[in-house]
Interface confidence: medium
Amino acid sequence: KKVVLGKKGDTVELTCNASQKKNTQFHWKNSNQIKILGIQGLFLTKGPSKLSDRADSRKSLWDQGCFSMIIKNLKIEDSDTYICEVENKKEEVELLVFGLTANSDTHLLEGQSLTLTLESPPGSSPSVKCRSPGGKNIQGGRTISVPQLERQDSGTWTCTVSQDQKTVEFKIDIVVLAFQKASSTVYKKEGEQVEFSFPLAFTLEKLTGSGELWWQAERASSSKSWITFDLKNKEVSVKRVTQDPKLQMGKKLPLHLTLPQALPQYAGSGNLTLALEAKTGKLHQEVNLVVMRATQFQENLTCEVWGPTSPKLTLSLKLENKGATVSKQAKAVWVLNPEAGMWQCLLSDSGQVLLESNIKVVPTWPTPVQP
């Protein structure tokens, strides 16, 4: 008996060939011997089966001895053994129809779980294997679960259902709702304008929700809400903003925040959350601000950084065009009685400069002694 696998909603063609390449009598019946379709004279006739409105045949191939049955808009319950009667012989074809669907919305938040459920005919024992757009492999039986979705799981999943050494393929598009980056750090000199950007890793026709940026300044004992906003059809409107600092927010996506000045008291970490309409849970992106200040006070030249820096970062004071350098894996470096000239303060990671500030040290002339 030939086995044919079909996909729910698809069209399948069950073939039946006569030995003589000519138009002859044929009938297709189901396992209950109910006639589905056949030929009477030169016309296609349909029987009383449930399939009658979805079954057809390729009339153009009849005179070549091909008497196929086409079933449109397949349903799981179409799974059955179909019998083609032609030239006093019977050909049996077992049709197994499968459906694979995500058991929830296919737009899921990062960290949420995805479950794919296989609909299959009674008595079948299929296996399912799926591959994510990033190459992650999973396999299962009636259900396949991905416990924690990551942003690289966004895209088309390829799933193969196998039964009796036959396979049928499914493609399922999954959208993982997340920011493009989990975390980002902005490095600024004191007084510079700061731009924070929060691009999304997905696009939706209508994007509605609300968000908030909580900030934990390094110098503060507790965090505070810097800004709250609404998102309506990709338009951003500010609801509430602190007086210090006075953040500005762009009206369009990607979410964009401007801090007029980088100051040591603002250095720290923030967490932007975005709650989307009709979705449980929130999207998160961490953002860090590191601020540098270079100062000269009397005979002391100091360079300091504030904010979340990793212990492997190096802070250096360097005299331009000279070898004089002071380097430390610390948040402050200083030089006593610095030579006159242009000094550079550098924050670097394995030789890559992240932040640089220049300060000019003027020569100090000895004060003339009063007679």
């Epitope: 294997k129 591959r131 990033g134 190459g135 992650k136 492999n137 396999q139 690289q152 088309t156 390829t158 193969t160 196998s162 050494q165 036959k166 396979t167 049928v168 393929e169 493609k171």
Partner: antibody, heavy 117, light 107 residues
Framework: EVQLVQSGAEVKKPGESLKISCKGS????????IGWVRQMPGKGLEWMGI????????TYSPSFQGQVTISADKSISTAYLQWSSLKASDTAMYYC??????????WGQGTLVTVSS | DIQMTQSPSSLSASVGDRVTITCRAS??????LAWYQQKPEKAPKSLIY???SLQSGVPSRFSGSGSGTDFTLTISSLQPEDFATYYC?????????FGQGTKLEIK
């Protein structure tokens, strides 16, 4: 019996184009990814990329993206690896393999490509 | 890309010896690791999948273990036909990558 049969050895000049093939039999060709692996003379195995013959979806290793094209013709259960302009450094043995959940469970016999002026 | 590092690069052993080859991934790959055997002028052959599952038809003297970043292939009692080059491969995320190989030679 699952089999992957590759086309024969090729000797080409630099700048020439080439398309080698891999014909699958004994299994549902459209239901498995097919991968290509390079082995340069005396060296190890390098994963080049894969194709899903069901709909010709491809994924390349960044090292080979833009250097080769992987394609398939499901009507004849055949996958292809092609170059538009060969270089001497493309001289290698190329294997196709059936990808079963990422594991290469069945391999072709290999196609030796020699590029020399 | 995930880097796969095999050690040793080459190994001399005698028939009957117990041999262990290790493979380290640059990041966690769960159990998505395969081992292959390749003999000169032949295509590689799959030995182990999912870090520890034996491919059908492969002798039981071959075994695999490990998960996360550290994996081993063990041959409990070397046979003459086992002298070959062995490769590990991760298939946790694209691009799937191979180790550089371990050549097992007769002492």
């Amino acid at each position: 019996e699952v089999q992957l049969v590759q086309s024969g050895a090729e000797v080409k000049k630099p700048g020439e184009s080439l398309k080698i093939s891999c014909k699958g039999s004994g299994y549902s060709f459209t239901g498995y990814w097919i991968g290509w692996v390079r082995q340069m003379p005396g060296k190890g195995l390098e994963w080049m990329g894969i194709i899903y013959p069901g709909d010709s979806d491809t994924t390349y290793s960044p090292s080979f993206q833009g250097q080769v094209t992987i394609s398939a013709d499901k009507s004849i259960s055949t996958a292809y690896l092609q170059w538009s302009s060969l270089k001497a450094s493309d001289t290698a043995m190329y294997y196709c393999a059936r990808d079963q959940l990422g594991l290469f469970d069945y391999w072709g016999q290999g196609t030796l490509v020699t590029v020399s002026s | 890309d995930i880097q796969m590092t095999q050690s040793p690069s080459s190994l001399s052993a005698s028939v009957g010896d117990r041999v262990t080859i290790t493979c380290r991934a640059s990041q966690g790959i769960s159990s998505w690791l395969a081992w292959y055997q390749q003999k000169p002028e032949k295509a590689p052959k799959s030995l182990i999948y999912s870090a520890s599952s034996l491919q059908s038809g492969v002798p039981s003297r071959f075994s695999g273990s490990g998960s996360g970043t550290d994996f081993t292939l063990t041959i409990s009692s070397l046979q003459p036909e086992d002298f070959a080059t062995y490769y590990c491969q991760q298939y946790d995320s694209y691009p799937y990558t191979f180790g550089q190989g371990t050549k097992l030679e007769i002492k």
